[in-house]
């Protein structure tokens, strides 16, 4: 039902859903800190623009009595329960910053008349694509898929002279929320990735993965998985790996690879790591006492959500336009705003664009090195290291089909 919004007469409120079931196990206190920081900055920016208005946030907490798994499995109804709570209290703000779980976002979008914008730190799944009033501030699965297809097709780089059309995908069901939806998108038979590949098989058991590593009859040399190096080691250990195998490790929200003094373990030599460019938030973890400086992309997405709202509020107020309109609800897309660490770009569908980075392990230095970058906004790959010191033959990535090694 329609709920009146606290969003007029110079007073603008943001409803922040603080859900027990969340895409990342980030303490809610950290998210509160991030939101409060965003509010301070937005107030400063509006004041600098000569706009004398009040901006506040209301934190809506779930009681946690029913939906207490702590992860996204029981989030579907929790989101709706929180919306009901907002509705009953007549406390809807101008914007909803909240659900990070794909299940809850999808359901909330489906079951409510959304005449207000919804900003999500998460909601990675394909089912949250192309939603008219939803903005996602962490890279959704669609962006990953487009990179992979682009990279598979690339055949004109000094280190990649073959187009690939095959892949194994390792997915055992224990993944984190981001990984779950990334791999789910690759697995889906109707997805862009599946459509563009000639062969794709999902490996669901550890043993299946381990067997492929040395199987002479394997149908692809490429295995995609999602997680950190430790996750790979648990699975692979020190097992021998055929020289043509390429493991693509998707680990977007982890900037440990860029820290000083990080040495790549030996088991990473057959691995290409896909992560996000760390931007300005490079940190040296040895300095981070108990308050991990915001490598925390999740908390940062909440913060940027507040800054995005401030950006849109400023534009609409300067143009003398009403905030509680469908026009405002649909405006949170196809724009660039000043985020906490610099410009943040949203695509036509309100999804954040970013620079993805593909890393390899140098056999000379045992360090992670940047092989190429990929700009999700223009769907374009930019090679960085033209003469990589790969473990693979001739310092080139092998063909994806066994038996047709690099030429």
């Amino acid at each position: 039902s329609q709920v009146s919004q606290n969003c007029h007469n110079g007073s603008y409120e943001i409803s922040v859903l603080m859900m027990g079931n969340s895409a990342f196990a980030e303490p809610l206190k950290n998210l509160e800190d991030a939101v409060n920081e965003g509010l301070e900055i937005v107030r400063g920016r509006l004041q600098n623009a000569g706009l004398n208005v009040t901006v506040n946030a209301t934190f809506m907490y779930s009681d946690g009595l029913i939906h207490n798994s702590g992860d996204c499995r029981s989030s579907t109804c929790e989101g709706l329960d929180l919306l009901r709570k907002i509705s009953n209290a007549q406390r809807m703000g101008c914007v909803l910053i909240g659900p990070s779980c794909t299940y809850s976002t999808f359901q909330m979008y489906l079951d409510t008349e959304l005449s207000y914008p919804m900003i999500s730190a998460g909601s990675f799944g394909l089912s949250c694509d192309y939603k008219e009033t939803l903005t996602r501030l962490m890279s959704p699965a669609r962006k990953l898929m487009y990179f992979l297809v682009n990279f598979w097709k690339t055949n004109d780089l000094p280190f990649k002279t073959y187009s690939w059309s095959t892949s194994y995908v390792y997915k055992n069901g224990t993944e984190t929320e981001d990984c779950f939806w990334y791999l789910n998108a690759l697995e889906a038979s109707v997805s862009y990735f599946s459509h563009e590949l000639g062969f794709k098989v999902v490996l669901r058991q550890d043993k299946e993965f381990q067997d492929i590593l040395m199987d002479h009859n394997r149908k692809s040399n490429v295995i995609i998985m999602c997680g950190g190096p430790e996750f790979l080691y648990k699975l692979k250990g020190d097992r021998a790996v055929a020289e043509d195998i390429v493991i693509i490790l998707v680990d977007l929200f982890n900037d440990q690879y860029f820290e000083d003094n990080v040495t790549a373990p030996d088991y990473m030599k057959n691995v290409l790591v896909l992560t996000l460019s760390p931007g300005n938030s490079l940190l040296n973890s040895s300095f981070s006492r108990n308050l991990s400086p915001t490598k925390r992309d999740f908390a940062l997405a909440y913060l940027n959500g507040i800054l995005l709202f401030g950006h849109m509020l400023k534009i609409f107020l300067e143009n003398g336009e009403n905030i509680t309109t469908p026009k405002f609800a649909h405006a949170f897309r196809n724009l660039t705003f000043e985020g906490y660490d610099g410009p943040v770009t949203l695509d036509d569908w309100g999804d954040v664009d970013s620079t993805m980075v593909l890393l390899y392990t140098s056999v000379d230095t045992k360090k992670y090195k940047v092989l190429l970058t990929y700009d999700t906004h223009v769907n374009k790959t930019y090679p960085v290291d033209m003469s990589p010191t790969f473990t693979w033959k001739n310092s080139k990535l092998p063909n994806d089909i066994t038996g047709r090694g690099p030429q």
Partner: nanobody, 123 residues
């Protein structure tokens, strides 16, 4: 071990200018919001200004607006406070502080602190 070392304080006449510096070591400087506080004799320590970790946003107390300018150089691990049109009531010990966010810094939540540098404005 985190160290914040302020410098640049001194005696200046009303209407004059000073530039304070704060050199940080032992912390990942680009990952922290940085700010300035001051404490006048017999008064509580008060927040003056803060800059976000990228340097993109600066926040000021009403008493500092229009006269003070905070900036940072992440390559040099250094924070600055340019103080213009100084008044006798700006006389205080000025402290550099670091925290995860400006919002935390203002509330003195897990702040790192320097030893301070004295600013005296004579009339």
């Amino acid at each position: 071990q985190v160290q914040l070392q302020e410098s640049g304080g001194g005696l200046v006449q009303a209407g004059g200018s000073l530039r304070l510096s704060c050199l940080a070591s032992g912390l990942a400087f680009p990952s922290y919001a940085m700010g300035w506080f001051r404490q006048a004799p017999g008064k509580e320590r008060e927040w003056v200004s803060c800059v976000t970790r990228s340097g993109g946003d600066t926040l000021y107390a009403d008493s500092a607006k229009g006269r003070f300018a905070i900036s940072r150089d992440n390559a040099k691990n250094t924070l600055y406070l340019q103080m213009n049109s100084l008044k006798p009531e700006d006389t205080a010990m000025y402290y550099c502080a670091a925290a995860l966010f400006c919002a935390n810094l203002r509330r003195n939540k897990d702040n790192y602190w320097g030893q301070g540098t004295q600013v005296t404005v004579s009339s």
